[in-house]
Interface confidence: medium
């Protein structure tokens, strides 16, 4: 059986949420039992079709209604022929979409005016992914390449922070991290040495 994937490039890039049909052409075999495989595991998808072009030529389709990141991978089709399994050339399916967060800012409890850091990381595809930081509804810096660390010199009240990740497909917003004030016991050095003034912000990753 001359087995090949037909009508699809070796690398296929699809946007998240879009449908995709992979085609597999089997020639030189009557009534092949075509199986689709993804990353080594047989795809148990009942949306598989077979078209007899002629007695010895069949096309198999694998239909995905709405691709997501987990559908990305290496696909091939295979048939059994005389007790041996023949496999096709693979198709690498890349699923592009808005950035996906791998690290989001976490809630913190800090003493008044004490410095702290928040982290944010997002990935594509497509790359590059850039990060913008927000304090409440105020944009406080960016864009900067992912991953990004926000260095804050201190806060004097409970404050909310979030990051936003951008790529060519759009943007995604992270969870909102709440930075709570940690109560400092009376008489502590922190209480004596820090004055209640507007916090200063340092964003080294946004500076030239």
């Amino acid at each position: 059986a001359g087995l090949k994937l037909m009508g699809a490039p070796v690398k296929l890039t699809v946007s998240q949420g879009q449908p995709v049909k992979l085609n597999c052409s089997v020639e030189g075999m009557e009534e092949p039992d075509i199986q689709w495989v993804k990353d080594g595991a047989v795809v148990q998808n009942l949306d598989q079709l077979y078209i007899p072009v002629s007695e010895q030529h069949w096309i198999g389709f694998l239909s995905l209604k709405s691709v997501e990141r987990s559908d990305a991978g290496r696909y091939w089709c295979q048939v059994e022929d005389g007790g041996e399994t023949e496999i096709s050339q693979p198709v690498w399916l890349t699923v592009e979409g808005v950035p996906f967060f791998t690290v989001e800012p976490k809630d913190l409890a800090v003493p008044p005016n004490a410095p702290f850091q928040l982290s944010c990381e997002a990935v594509g595809p497509p790359e590059p992914v850039t990060i913008v930081w927000w304090r409440g509804t105020t944009k406080i810096g960016g864009p900067a390449p992912s991953p990004s660390v926000l260095n804050v010199t201190g806060v004097t009240q409970s404050t909310m922070f979030s990051c936003e990740a951008h790529n060519l497909k759009g943007l995604a917003s992270s969870r909102t991290a709440t930075v709570h004030l940690q109560l400092v016991p009376r008489g502590s050095s922190a209480h004596h040495h820090h004055h209640h003034h507007h916090s200063a912000w340092s964003h080294p990753q946004f500076e030239k």
């Epitope: 998808n45 009942l46 949306d47 079709l49 077979y50 007899p52 096309i59 995905l64 209604k65």
Partner: antibody, heavy 125, light 108 residues
Amino acid sequence: EVQLVQSGADVKKPGASLTISCQASGYTFTDYWISWVRQKPGKGLEWMGQINRHASNTMYGPSFQGHVTISADRSTATAYLQWRSLEASDTAMYYCVRSGGATSGGTIPEYYQHWGPGTLVTVSS
Amino acid sequence: SYELTQPPSVSVSPGQTARITCSGDALPKKYAYWYQQKSGQAPVLVIYEDWKRASGIPERFSGSSSGTMATLTISGAQVEDEADYYCYSQERKGNYFVFGGGTKLTVL
């Protein structure tokens, strides 16, 4: 013309075994899969399972796994649904359906469009 | 196990638009199919792959799918459309199919 001819109605006692059949004609049997669907009296449709084009692989709905066996004979273009031990709750109409598989001329997928007339199975003591 | 949820009944007057919904967690990823079953008859395929009309089905029948909800719409319902309607789809991994509980459409 596509036809799915099912075996006749049957009355059995609880604990009895039973096999019902679905013979296909008007198309190449190995171009399509066959599904079985149950409908209890006055109730909705339930997908039981299906057998692939080459009668080499079966899939079952969670409620039916282990309770029924789906098989097929390619030489006679016939699919079967078998019980080893019937229960009163198996009383229902059973339909076979042509599903999956090839498409006519490679255009419109007509899978799930052709149904047998149904086989009524009554299990009563 | 996976479930598809339909309203038990929908009633419309002749000429009105009937909408029957089907809800399932996997519907963003899996196609919905719709069947019509009249009393004492085998089901008939009406819509496949969310929105495609099966051969021989009148144009007043249409289908759509958005998120976890699939919808069968009958624009200008007629008395002969009175039947039970079932949605049909796969569970998320594609290991088995499921029917919805069915919706009885009354056109009075």
